[in-house]
Amino acid sequence: KSSNEATNITPKHNMKAFLDELKAENIKKFLYNFTQIPHLAGTEQNFQLAKQIQSQWKEFGLDSVELAHYDVLLSYPNKTHPNYISIINEDGNEIFNTSLFEPPPPGYENVSDIVPPFSAFSPQGMPEGDLVYVNYARTEDFFKLERDMKINCSGKIVIARYGKVFRGNKVKNAQLAGAKGVILYSDPADYFAPGVKSYPDGWNLPGGGVQRGNILNLNGAGDPLTPGYPANEYAYRRGIAEAVGLPSIPVHPIGYYDAQKLLEKMGGSAPPDSSWRGSLKVPYNVGPGFTGNFSTQKVKMHIHSTNEVTRIYNVIGTLRGAVEPDRYVILGGHRDSWVFGGIDPQSGAAVVHEIVRSFGTLKKEGWRPRRTILFASWDAEEFGLLGSTEWAEENSRLLQERGVAYINADSSIEGNYTLRVDCTPLMYSLVHNLTKELKSPDEGFEGKSLYESWTKKSPSPEFSGMPRISKLGSGNDFEVFFQRLGIASGRARYTKNWETNKFSGYPLYHSVYETYELVEKFYDPMFKYHLTVAQVRGGMVFELANSIVLPFDCRDYAVVLRKYADKIYSISMKHPQEMKTYSVSFDSLFSAVKNFTEIASKFSERLQDFDKSNPIVLRMMNDQLMFLERAFIDPLGLPDRPFYRHVIYAPSSHNKYAGESFPGIYDALFDIESKVDPSKAWGEVKRQIYVAAFTVQAAAETLSEVA
């Protein structure tokens, strides 16, 4: 529990006062306000919302609220030259065209500036050719096609269903396979839950609904033209040919009505197994090309989107700390949306707004947090986490010296079943302790704690009686803070039941149908799940900013390091002969993990009984805790991914959304049996074991007694 140290606090100004001030009705009101028009990054509407949030945060009582602007590369469809896909006959005539826009939802027919579905940063082009169906376009799907089925995608247009992995990885995989275009579509198997109606009568995706999204492979670079540095007024910008992460082939998304028209004619090979079949009434033939009667027909893409350097605006609010103003706890979430942003991001932004209001209320009553709290409304998250990354690049020296923690606040809900938390192991105990103090909003758990309902519905696969907490991956604004800068990070939201709902994300993700009504009618009419998420996110920020000793437990890192070392060793041991031939040993890594475990245990003992009234010793111990996450950063970064610098965690090279442990070793081992030069490949495995072992040992030593 947080203590009421002498920071102008009266007994009522504790965590309870902060939590009691959070109101579901306010979150509902804020969500409505934020979702009435589109707030696409780089548009006037989103600039106006930034100024509104700035004004309201000032009213709520923050010490300062500033706009931080950057000029970054964004991507938009051509308003006079729409993007679409055709089926053309042998004479080149278009006999079928995909739709140019989504039918607007009821009540929104007259809203202007709804951006039509597009794949942001697609290059222009009009490729035509035979279609190949590539399932989810995952690495393993292309292995199946190329290695097992001997199907060559070179010079073909591929069609892939959304889901399972980040869309940018799909496009990268298609490019590597030699495809000349990519069509992405939402299959009902992944975006239509059985027994639920489609919007506006339920929360399922209608046939005309389409998922927008960027298709970059930035690997943490931020603005593609200014990797590593802020896109400010004196920035040096790369030429577009040298830009980071841009796709090289045209890409376009469609809904399942249009996909049906393309897939129903597919010929060639049958699907290899049932995992390649979706729920449409089509054969899911792989191709290449159309079946007999239609074999002379081809698919043609018409993509005319443009990339433009455009100004974006972050809102940065500060609540100065009373005791340690040079220690920053950050709560950030994005503001830009693809269209209305009913869930993504405004269900998160509304929660941040209410958290700011509650903190502001306490501040107006004379309270201050021990440490400084920074609040951020990020811009251009949907275009590659650009706002957060540029701000972190601009402030990297301050952040690496002063950053205590970052709590992310994108969508508060992706379902209404149970809590979902991804965070650094340093925060496990904080999350456990906090959720034990909060009431569960779930039906059937009245009077029970959030911890109890969460543990029951989402149990840890390793530890009985504890809830599942996942690794941080990417695909959201914590990326630069955690993966690049090594600032302890976490995120929390309400999620679906993954066991019974196998669809990817939520069905209306990034479509025009993600409205206020979607949330208010179908997901959270009482806004009780939003309130719970506000309590979790806000409670974490409160504790991180206010507890005398930072609420980090380094022993939990020791536990996971052992688990991750065991896991990567077992992957390597699938190749026992090569490990022997090339003298591959994990002894150094296991030794480092053992040392870390012993040193962390001793540090925790010292943490229990040091003199907390001595400000120098207190600061010293807290700094060791704060800098532990930083100690896992390798300044050289991961191979070919210089902005992913965390040695223990990185976004998976095959799915940006997922986290991978010991990513350097994992990637060195991946598909190693196909590397043309095994000696070189196993040499890289050995090098990565060395880097990991050194890093764990070096991190352990930061927890040793300082003298």
Partner: antibody
Framework: SVKLQESGPGLVAPSQSLSITCTVS????????VSWIRQPPGKGLEWLGV???????YYNSPLKSRLSINKDNSKSQVFLKMNSLQTDDSAMYYC??????????WGQGTSVTVSS | TVLTQSPAIMSASPGEKVTMTCRAS???????LHWYQQKSSASPKLWIY???NLASGVPARFSGSGSGTSYSLTISSLEAEDAATYYC?????????FGAGTKLELK
């Protein structure tokens, strides 16, 4: 296109040493390994050893003490040296590009006869 | 690991289905079992890699299969140009080893 060309002395006296050069084109020795294989007249194939792109070498154990494989990346050349030749070392000697654990392109071979 | 090929010599008529086998003295990963074709006074050519993958230019009448210690090469319909010696090769640690070969002759 990928090519490998062996060049050797043809005739070697017993107890003398053998040096063969393999000159490659169409690929880089910094990316691929090269193996040496020999085939005595009318017999099967025997793998001698490999030099990988990182310079690591592995040899067939019974021959290890007599064999050495080196390379010059800049000249795209790989060198086989074999000491203390006996008549049963007479064979066609091939170099081959080594990909994973296959030899996917082979030279045309150079014939070596050990005789006084 | 010792590879034993059988038969050592076989003859078959054009159009016939032909199968030759390669047995390993200990288990070999299917990723590391390959076949080569050698015609008289020519260099060997990679013919089938990773048990079942045809090398570039190899006719589709050839196929490979197997796992563990037993592998085979099959020609669905023999043609005159297929007359050659076929060697299997494995890796399960150095040294790489070849079978003694199966010589395929035309009747």
């Amino acid at each position: 296109s990928v090519k490998l060309q062996e060049s050797g002395p043809g005739l070697v006296a017993p107890s003398q040493s053998l040096s063969i050069t393999c000159t490659v084109s169409g690929f880089s020795l910094t990316d691929y390994g090269v193996s040496w294989i020999r085939q005595p007249p009318g017999k099967g194939l025997e793998w001698l050893g490999v030099i990988w792109s990182d310079g690591n070498t592995y040899y067939n154990s019974p021959l290890k003490s007599r064999l050495s494989i080196n390379k010059d990346n800049s000249k795209s050349q790989v060198f086989l040296k074999m000491n203390s030749l006996q008549t049963d070392d007479s064979a066609m000697y091939y170099c081959a590009r080594h990909k994973v654990y296959t030899m996917d392109y082979w030279g045309q071979g150079t014939s070596v006869t050990v005789s006084s | 690991t010792v590879l034993t090929q059988s038969p050592a010599i076989m003859s078959a008529s054009p159009g016939e289905k032909v199968t030759m086998t390669c047995r390993a003295s200990s288990s070999v990963s299917s990723s590391y079992l390959h076949w080569y074709q050698q015609k008289s006074s020519a260099s060997p050519k990679l013919w089938i890699y990773r048990t079942s993958n045809l090398a570039s230019g190899v006719p589709a009448r050839f196929s490979g299969s197997g796992s563990g210690t037993s592998y085979s090469l099959t020609i669905s319909s023999l043609e005159a140009e297929d007359a050659a010696t076929y060697y299997c090769q494995q890796y399960s640690g150095y040294p790489l080893t070849f079978g003694a070969g199966t010589k395929l002759e035309l009747k």
